[in-house]
C-alpha cells in the first residue's frame, strides 16, 4: 500500500510510472491497433475534462497544479501507448471522493487499454482534507494532459 | 439478426447537401461505433466516419470540412451529412457497424446510390 | 494514409480449382502478433459481407474454402476450391490505423 502526504509525491510517483517502459503486453487477441486505441482516447477526452472543469468549478479554493506534464507515451513502442495500468489505482483510489458515474466509465476505457498480466498498485488518498482535494485535482490535471499527448502523437503520424 | 438500412434522396443537385439516414434493428446505437462508406462508381470503396455508442464522432481527413454524421438514439438512426456536394460524390452509400475492438466490420446496410446532377 | 493494393483487378478460375488474391499494405498493419486486415465478398446488388477478419480468422457462417493469411504487409485471400456462388468482387481493408482504407477490390469470374 502506497500512502502520500500530498500531490508532489503522487505526481511524482505517477510521473516515475510514466516514464517506466513497458515489457509486458496484452495477450495478441486483446492488443488494440492505434486505431482501435484512438477511439478510446476519444472518448476518454471530453469525460476527462468534464470532470476536471466540474472539480474545478465545485473546488474553487484549491489552488491549480503547474506540475510538469507527464511523460505518459512509452518511448520504446510505435505507436505510441498510453500507460494504463499506471494510472488506474488513482482513478479506483478517487472514485468514491468524486463523480462515480464519470470515474466508471473511464475506468471501464482504460480497462480496454490495460496491459494484461500487470499488476495494479493500490493507493491510499491523503487524509487531510485540503490535501485530498489537492490530490484529486492533481490526478484529473495530470490526466488531461496526458490524454491531449497521447491523442497528438496518435495524430501525427502518416495520416 | 442485425439490420442496417439506408435511405434518402436518390439525386443532390451540385452544391447542395446530401442527408442520408441508417436505420438499424436488432442492436441499440448506445452500444458499438457506426459507421458511413461509399463505393464510387469504379468500384472504389472509401471509409466516411463513425458516431460511436457515446456520440462521439470521427471523420476522415478528406472528407472532415463537409462532413458530419449524427443520431437520434431514440429511433435508433443515425445520420450522414456531406455539403457542398459535387459530382465526385456521386456514390452508392452505405452504412456498417463495427461492434468490437479489434474486430471488422461485420453487418453492412444493402447501400443507397445518389447522383449528384443538375 | 495507408495504401491497399490489390492484385490482380481480375480472375477468371475454373469451378474446383484455386482462386489466390493477394494484398499489398504500404506499412505494416501488425501489432503484438495481429494483423488488422479483414477481406470482404461483395456480390452484384448486394452489400459487402466480412468473410475474413484480421487476416486469417473466419466470420461465422462463412464456408472453410475460404481462406486468408499472411502478416505486416503481405496478405493473401485463397478461395479453393471456387464454386459458382464465388462470383464475385473481393475487397481487403485495414483498421490498423485512421483513416481505414481499402483495397481497389478484385473480380472474381468462372471460366
Known amino acids: 500500500m502506497l500512502s502520500h502526504t500530498g500531490p508532489s509525491r503522487f505526481a511524482l510517483f505517477l510521473l516515475c510510472s510514466m516514464e517506466t517502459l513497458l515489457s509486458s503486453h496484452m495477450a495478441p487477441t486483446h492488443q488494440l491497433p492505434p486505431s482501435d486505441v484512438r477511439k478510446i482516447i476519444l472518448e476518454l477526452q471530453p469525460l476527462s475534462r468534464g470532470l476536471l472543469e466540474d472539480y474545478q468549478k465545485k473546488e474553487t479554493g484549491v489552488p491549480e497544479s503547474n506540475r510538469t506534464l507527464l511523460l505518459c507515451l512509452t518511448s520504446d513502442s510505435q505507436p505510441p501507448r498510453l500507460n494504463s495500468s499506471a494510472i488506474l489505482p488513482y482513478f479506483r483510489a478517487i472514485r468514491p471522493l468524486s463523480d462515480k458515474n464519470i470515474i466508471d466509465k473511464i475506468i471501464e476505457q482504460l480497462d480496454k487499454l490495460k496491459f494484461q498480466h500487470e499488476p495494479e498498485t493500490e493507493i491510499s488518498v491523503p487524509a487531510d482534507t485540503f490535501e485530498c482535494k489537492s490530490f484529486i485535482l492533481t490526478i484529473l490535471q495530470q490526466f488531461s494532459a496526458c490524454l491531449e499527448s497521447v491523442f497528438k502523437s496518435l495524430n501525427s503520424g502518416p495520416q | 439478426e442485425v439490420q442496417l438500412v439506408e435511405s434518402g434522396p436518390s439525386l443532390v443537385k451540385p452544391g447542395g447537401s446530401l442527408r442520408l439516414t441508417c436505420s438499424v434493428t436488432?442492436?441499440?446505437?448506445?452500444?458499438?461505433?457506426w459507421n458511413w462508406i461509399r463505393k464510387f462508381p469504379g468500384n472504389k470503396l472509401e471509409y466516411m466516419g463513425y458516431i460511436s455508442y457515446s456520440g462521439i464522432t470521427d471523420y476522415n481527413p478528406s472528407l472532415k470540412s463537409r462532413i458530419t454524421i449524427s443520431r437520434d438514439t431514440s429511433k435508433n438512426q443515425y445520420y450522414l451529412q456531406l455539403n457542398s456536394v459535387t459530382t465526385e460524390d456521386t456514390a452508392t452509400y452505405y452504412c456498417?457497424?463495427?461492434?468490437?475492438?479489434?474486430?471488422?466490420?461485420?453487418?453492412w446496410g444493402q447501400g443507397t446510390s445518389v447522383t449528384v446532377s443538375s | 494514409d495507408i495504401v491497399m493494393t490489390q492484385s490482380p483487378a481480375s480472375l477468371s478460375v475454373s469451378l474446383g480449382q484455386r482462386a489466390t488474391i493477394s494484398c499489398r499494405a504500404s506499412?505494416?498493419?501488425?501489432?503484438?502478433?495481429?494483423?488488422?486486415m479483414h477481406w470482404y465478398q461483395q456480390k452484384p446488388g448486394q452489400s459487402p459481407k466480412l468473410l475474413i477478419y484480421?487476416?486469417?480468422n473466419l466470420e461465422s457462417g462463412i464456408p472453410a474454402r475460404f481462406g486468408g493469411s499472411g502478416s505486416g504487409t503481405d496478405f493473401t485471400l485463397t478461395i479453393d476450391p471456387v464454386q459458382a456462388d464465388d462470383v464475385a468482387t473481393y475487397y481487403c481493408?485495414?483498421?490498423?490505423?485512421?483513416?481505414?482504407?481499402f483495397g481497389g477490390g478484385t473480380k472474381l469470374e468462372i471460366k
Open positions: 481493408q485495414q483498421s490498423y490505423e485512421d483513416p481505414w482504407t
Open positions: 484480421r487476416a486469417s
Open positions: 456498417a457497424r463495427y461492434g468490437n475492438y479489434g474486430y471488422a466490420m461485420d453487418y
Open positions: 506499412e505494416s498493419v501488425d501489432t503484438y502478433g495481429n494483423s488488422f
Open positions: 436488432g442492436d441499440s446505437i448506445t452500444s458499438g461505433y
